[in-house]
């Protein structure tokens, strides 16, 4: 699906790192791990906790609707960032010289509005605002818009 | 556990300032992607929502109340506060606080304003 | 200020009636919608986010569906206890708004 214009036409300008060093937990409580090439994520149930991918979390303002939560995620200790691609894709990892301080057309796709409720954690597409961050069962994280993907994640 | 009380005159008369006040445990305002809501409900009506407020001071007003409204917060005490000033009879109605993404609500208290 | 426009206002239903809810937003609020559900003399009860996830400890009768501006809230098998004001809400921008309430009442 093509990238929504209404939020890609947003400015979303750096205001500070809010969580870091977490790690996020699917519905099947697998955990995330960084693919052999580097540039995917995927799910599993890990024995071998080092593998578990941790995260940074950015928060940033739109300048526009201060209604929603827009966010970047970084893997941790990298400059490797979460990036949408489209409905069931796979997430990709960006690799950005820094953190971005204004993201801007067609760079939204490493926005996401996060939103935690019921003590789960969403994370909606900017770029497609009608996709999740979601899972399956021992596959790439990838984007969704739901069922039969997983689209909550604990954070710990 | 969340937990939200509000607290406020019970009466006043048109023309007066109405002082409500939400206290509230389970989370802090200072943590970010936390918010306070209120939304009010006349008797036998409909919610309406009114203001927010949440962390790194955002504020976000309904824009038909927001020439008469200031919100604040003590975030040390976990107290949002909400001033309507030059109310009416039409501002008669239970008013409710709520969390960010309003899955819990206080019980609400009922504002009368009559001279 | 995005306007949603709930109907019926009114549902007379017997015990173990299926019942629907819709919700029309005035424009698109993507997914953004809550259905909640309000027993005479408490406050609002979240049953329904994001259009179609059910909250904590809701019973699976209750179901939502949509995307952008038409929503939908099904109860498959009304009870005696969902006697209610049933309300739809977007929050997808600010304003957040509600829906005018549909009050369900059991012959």
């Known amino acids: 699906s093509a990238p929504y214009t209404y939020q890609s036409d947003l400015r979303y300008k750096l205001m500070k790192l809010v969580r870091q060093k977490f790690v996020m937990n699917d519905s099947l409580n697998q955990t995330i791990y960084q693919d052999v090439d580097k540039h995917y994520l995927s799910t599993t149930w890990l024995n071998d906790l080092q593998q578990e991918v941790k995260f940074d979390m950015y928060a940033y303002s739109s300048g526009g609707d201060d209604s929603k939560y827009p966010v970047t995620l970084k893997i941790s200790d990298s400059q490797l960032f979460v990036s949408a691609q489209g409905e069931d894709q796979p997430v990709l990892l960006k690799e950005l010289p820094e953190t971005p301080k204004l993201i801007t057309g067609s760079e939204t796709d490493l926005i996401f509005f996060w939103k935690s409720i019921n003590s789960k954690n969403y994370f909606t597409s900017a770029a497609y605002p009608e996709l999740f961050i979601a899972t399956k069962e021992q596959s790439r994280v990838h984007l969704a818009r739901g069922l039969p993907s997983m689209t909550d994640f604990q954070i710990s | 556990q969340v937990i939200l009380k509000e607290s406020g005159p019970g009466i006043l008369q048109p023309s007066q300032t109405l002082s409500l006040t939400c206290s509230f445990s389970g989370f802090s305002l200072s943590t970010y992607g936390t918010a306070v809501n209120w939304i009010r409900q006349p008797s036998g009506k409909g919610l309406e929502w009114l203001a927010q407020?949440?962390?790194?001071?955002?504020?976000l007003y309904n824009p038909f109340l927001k020439s008469r409204i200031t919100l604040s917060e003590d975030t040390s005490n976990s107290q949002v506060f909400l001033k309507i000033t030059s109310v009416d009879t039409e501002d008669s109605a239970t008013y409710y606080c709520?969390?960010?993404?309003?899955?819990?609500w206080g019980l609400g208290t009922s504002v009368t304003v009559s001279s | 200020s995005i306007v949603m426009t709930q109907t019926p206002k009114f549902l007379l239903v017997s015990a173990g009636d299926r019942v629907t809810i819709t919700c029309k937003a005035s424009q698109s609020v993507n997914h953004d919608v809550a259905w909640y559900q309000q027993m005479p003399g408490q406050s609002p009860k979240l049953l329904i986010y994001?259009?179609?996830n059910r909250y904590t400890g809701v019973p699976d009768r209750f179901t939502g569906s949509g995307y952008g501006t038409d929503f939908t809230f099904t109860i498959s098998t009304v009870q005696a206890e969902d006697l209610a004001v049933y309300f739809c809400?977007?929050?997808?921008?600010?304003?957040?708004?509600f829906g005018g309430g549909t009050k369900l009442e059991i012959k």
């Open positions: 407020i949440g962390s790194d001071d955002r504020k």
């Open positions: 994001f259009a179609s």
């Open positions: 709520a969390n960010g993404v309003m899955e819990y």
């Open positions: 809400q977007q929050d997808y921008s600010s304003p957040y708004t």
